[in-house]
C-alpha cells in the first residue's frame, strides 16, 4: 500500500469560449481508494479555488460553467490525489481559454450537383456554423475544411474553405457516389470533429476534360484554392 501516483491534466477544451472542461489521468492508486480534487487560481490572484463541477465532464474531469469562465485570464490549475498513505500533485497547467476552443462540427451540410447550361458542372457544398458559436460578437473567426471521397475510395480529398460557408468543387468522377464532410476551427484553437457524412450521387454525364479541372479563382468566386502540403500541415497543427 502506497501513496497515489502523480496525476496528469492532459486536456482542456472549450466549445465556445463561454465554458470549458479539463480532464486528468490518475496515477497509480497505491492499492487504496483515492480521492481527486482540482484546485486553481487565476493570473494575478493568490486566492485558491476548487473545481466547481466534477460531474458534467464525466470521470476525472472538471467543468467550468459560464460563471467560472473568463477569456481574459490564465488559469493555473493542478490535481491532488489523496489516499490513506499520502498525497501527490500533478504539475501545474496554465490554461488560456482563447487557445483551447474546439467547436462542435458545422451543421446543416447540404450538397448539390449544379449543371448550369452556360457553365461547367460543379458540386455545390453549403453548411452552417455550430450553434454554440456566436460569430456576431467578433470574438470568433471560424475556418472551415471540407473532405470528400468516392464511397469505396480509401483516400480523402481535402479542401480548405477559409471563412466561407459554401464551396464549389469541379473535379469529380462521373457516376460515383461521394461522401462529403466539413469541419471547423477557430483561429487559435482545435479542429472540430468532422460533421456527419452527406452522400451525393454524381451523374454519369458530369464530364469535363483535364483543361477544365484547373479553373481560375475568378470563375469560382474565389472559393476553390489549391492547397500545398505546407498549408495542410499548418491547418492541422492542432
Amino acid at each position: 500500500q502506497l501513496p497515489p501516483g502523480k496525476p496528469e491534466i492532459f486536456k482542456c477544451r472549450s466549445p465556445n469560449k463561454e465554458t470549458f472542461t479539463c480532464w486528468w489521468r490518475p496515477g497509480t492508486d497505491g492499492g487504496l481508494p483515492t480521492n481527486y480534487s482540482l484546485t486553481y487560481h487565476r493570473e494575478g490572484e493568490t486566492l485558491m479555488h476548487e473545481c466547481p463541477d466534477y460531474i458534467t465532464g464525466g470521470p476525472n474531469s472538471c467543468h467550468f460553467g459560464k460563471q467560472y469562465t473568463s477569456m481574459w485570464r490564465t488559469y493555473i490549475m493542478m490535481v491532488n490525489a489523496t489516499n490513506q498513505m499520502g498525497s501527490s500533485f500533478s504539475d501545474e497547467l496554465y490554461v488560456d481559454v482563447t487557445y483551447i476552443v474546439q467547436p462542435d462540427p458545422p451543421l446543416e451540410l447540404a450538397v448539390e450537383v449544379k449543371q448550369p447550361e452556360d457553365r461547367k458542372p460543379y458540386l455545390w457544398i453549403k453548411w452552417s456554423p455550430p450553434t454554440l458559436i456566436d460569430l456576431k460578437t467578433g470574438w470568433f473567426t471560424l475556418l472551415y475544411e471540407i473532405r470528400l471521397k468516392p464511397e469505396k475510395a480509401a483516400e480523402w480529398e481535402i479542401h480548405f474553405a477559409g471563412q466561407q460557408t459554401e464551396f464549389k468543387i469541379l473535379s469529380l468522377h462521373p457516376g460515383q457516389k461521394y461522401l462529403v464532410q466539413v469541419r471547423c476551427k477557430p483561429d487559435h484553437g482545435y479542429w472540430s470533429a468532422w460533421s456527419p457524412a452527406t452522400f451525393i450521387q454524381i451523374p454519369s454525364d458530369f464530364t469535363m476534360n483535364d483543361e477544365q479541372k484547373l479553373i481560375s479563382e475568378e470563375d469560382l468566386g474565389g472559393e476553390q484554392k489549391l492547397i500545398s502540403e505546407e498549408d495542410l500541415h499548418h491547418h492541422h497543427h492542432h
Epitope: 493570473e43 479555488h49 460563471q67 491532488n80
Partner: antibody, heavy 118, light 107 residues
Framework: EVHLVESGGGLVQPGGSLRLSCAAS????????MNWVRQTPGKGLEWISH????????YYADSVKGRFTISRDNAKNSLFLQMNSLRAEDTAVYFC???????????WGQGTLVTVSS | EIVLTQSPATLSLSPGERATLSCRAS??????FAWYQQKPGQAPRLLIY???SRATGIPTRFSGSGSGTDFTLTISSLEPEDFAVYYC?????????FGQGTRLEIK
Amino acid sequence: EVHLVESGGGLVQPGGSLRLSCAASGFTFSSYEMNWVRQTPGKGLEWISHISSRSVIIYYADSVKGRFTISRDNAKNSLFLQMNSLRAEDTAVYFCAGITIFGIPEYWGQGTLVTVSS
Amino acid sequence: EIVLTQSPATLSLSPGERATLSCRASQSVSSYFAWYQQKPGQAPRLLIYDASSRATGIPTRFSGSGSGTDFTLTISSLEPEDFAVYYCQQRSSWPITFGQGTRLEIK
C-alpha cells in the same frame, strides 16, 4: 429564486459557543464556494471564512482562526459555522454568502445577530 | 493583508448629479475587485465585479473602472434609491478585505 437563510444566532456569554447554519436553495449549492462575512458597527464588513465546493480549500481570518470552524453538507444544501471561545468583539451580524461569478459572492442571506455579553 | 482606503467618507449630492467614489489598495489586486451597495437593515448587494463588469440586474448608470491599486465607481445620474453606503472589496488574496465604506447622502 436563490435564498440563503441564516439561523443559530443569539446571546451568548464570553467563552461560550454557538453554531450558525445557512440553508440554501435555488441554485446548485454543491458547485459554489461559500463564505461567512460579519458586520460590526465598529469594524464594518469582515470576511471571516471561506469553503470550497467539496471542502478542499478552507480559509479563516486571523481574528477567528483556531476558534471558528466552517463546514458544509452538500447533501442538505447547508453551510455551518461552529464558533467556540466567543469574545465580546465577535458581536456582529453574520451573513452567509454564495460565490457565483469569478469568486465574487452575489447571493447573500439577510444575516443573523450574534451578541457576546455577560 | 491588503488595506483598502475609500474616499470620500461621505458624499453629499442631489438626485440627477454624477457621483464618483474612489478606492485605493495598499498593493496591486489586478482587477479582482468589486463594489457593493448596502442599505440599512439589508445585506450588501453586488454592483460591480472584476473592476468593471456589472452584476446581473444592475442599472447601466453604475460603472466601474481601474486596475492595480486605484479604482473608481461612477453613478452617472443619481436616482433617489442610490443613496446608501458603498463598499469596495478585493479578492485577489486572502484575507479578502473591504474598504471602510463611503456614505452617499442626499444634499
